[in-house]
């Protein structure tokens, strides 16, 4: 079951509480009524698990990727899992920890020694899950070694948003991923209504910037569900 799988990996796949190591004994939640606050639980033990649901790798931390915790397990259940270290098996780049990338199903180092000039590598990009590409074929993309050492500008090839400069995110463009601008107020955004629908986009948009959310444009409320236009709007 999902519980047993997650319990078996509880500490491995969880961050330590703020301000302490995992399992640090500690204090209760603040007594102030009706207040949310950072790390309110920071010294609580984590013998239990705290799965963080996701639909895309970008929703997880830089040391994580988004996937189903069990093969053949709960269909559609995806959570953030700890990244794979060097020489571990992988199916896509985001599964490998920072400083590594997925090559021939194995996480390998992406340091200078492995990138003399430009190299050609296979990006097996997964669209919506761990096990498939859009049409079942790998796409070959030329990656520059520079992208692993400087933050990518708009249009630069990337593996994850942390590869991109501030104000940019890593989003799909055809069968590679490039740095695109985070959406600003009033810009059209994509609202994923169906589970896994983000996997069908070959021209993926970034998410809305801080303080904005993707909502139906006011004058489109009467439109049919399928034609509703969503834009980034202030709360």
């Amino acid at each position: 079951t999902l519980n047993s799988v997650l319990n078996s990996n509880a500490i491995k796949n969880l961050p330590p509480p703020l301000g302490g190591a995992a399992g640090h004994p500690g204090s209760a939640v603040s007594a102030a009524p009706g207040i949310l606050y950072p790390g309110g639980n920071k010294y609580q033990t984590i013998d239990n698990y705290q799965p963080y649901p996701c639909a895309e790798d970008e929703e997880c931390g830089t040391d994580e990727y988004c996937a189903s915790p069990t093969r053949g397990g709960d269909a559609g259940v995806q959570i953030c899992l700890a990244c794979r270290k060097r020489r571990k098996r992988c199916m896509r780049h985001a599964m490998c920890c920072p400083g590594n990338y997925c090559k021939n199903g194995i996480c390998v180092s992406s340091d200078q020694n492995h990138f003399r000039g430009e190299i050609e590598e296979t990006i097996t990009e997964s669209f919506g899950n761990d096990h498939s590409t859009l049409d079942g074929y790998s796409r070959r993309t030329t990656l520059s070694s520079k992208m692993y050492h400087t933050k990518g500008q708009e249009g630069s090839v990337c593996l994850r948003s942390s590869d991109c400069a501030s104000g940019l995110c890593c989003a799909r463009h055809f069968w590679s991923k490039i740095c695109k601008p985070v959406l600003k107020e009033g810009q059209v955004c994509t609202k994923h209504r169906r589970k896994g629908s983000h996997g069908l986009e070959i021209f993926q948009r970034c998410y809305c910037g801080e303080g904005l959310s993707c909502r139906i444009q006011k004058d489109h409320h009467q439109a049919s569900n399928s034609s509703r236009l969503h834009t980034c709007q202030r709360h």
């Epitope: 949310l36 950072p38 970008e58």
Partner: nanobody, 125 residues
């Protein structure tokens, strides 16, 4: 300071339903996963359910699967927990939690960094 307005807790008979809501203000939660946890007397706090920022991905504890439904309304900055077919063992203090936004906010691990004050749910037999 982030304010959290919670409602929906209370006393209910076994087999009954309750809906918890957790509305946040003062910080943008639309980009973060949100979850519900609970703590019964003398027990550790346990995970109940969580939902990602867009609502496209949800995860449930085995003990509540098929009975509880988590949902969210980003326009209202609110997350809901619909609890049906309640059992006496569901009796606990229920907590709402918000995530940190993961790598998009510079974090190495996606985690629940913001926790709310609990609301009591009591299921009588």
């Amino acid at each position: 300071e982030v304010q959290l307005v919670k409602s929906g807790g209370g006393l209910v008979q076994a087999g009954g339903s309750l809906r918890l809501s957790c509305a946040a203000s003062g910080r943008t939660f639309s980009s973060y996963a949100m979850g519900w946890f609970r703590q019964a007397p003398g027990k550790e706090r346990e995970f109940v359910a969580a939902i990602n920022w867009s609502g496209s991905s949800t995860v449930y504890a085995d003990s509540v699967k098929g009975r509880f439904t988590i949902s969210r309304d980003n326009a209202e900055n609110t997350v809901y927990l619909q609890m049906n077919s309640l059992k006496p063992e569901d009796t606990a203090v229920y907590y709402c939690a918000a995530g940190n936004g993961g790598r998009n906010y510079g974090h190495s691990r996606a985690r629940y960094d913001y926790w709310g004050q609990g609301t009591q749910v009591t299921v009588s037999s």
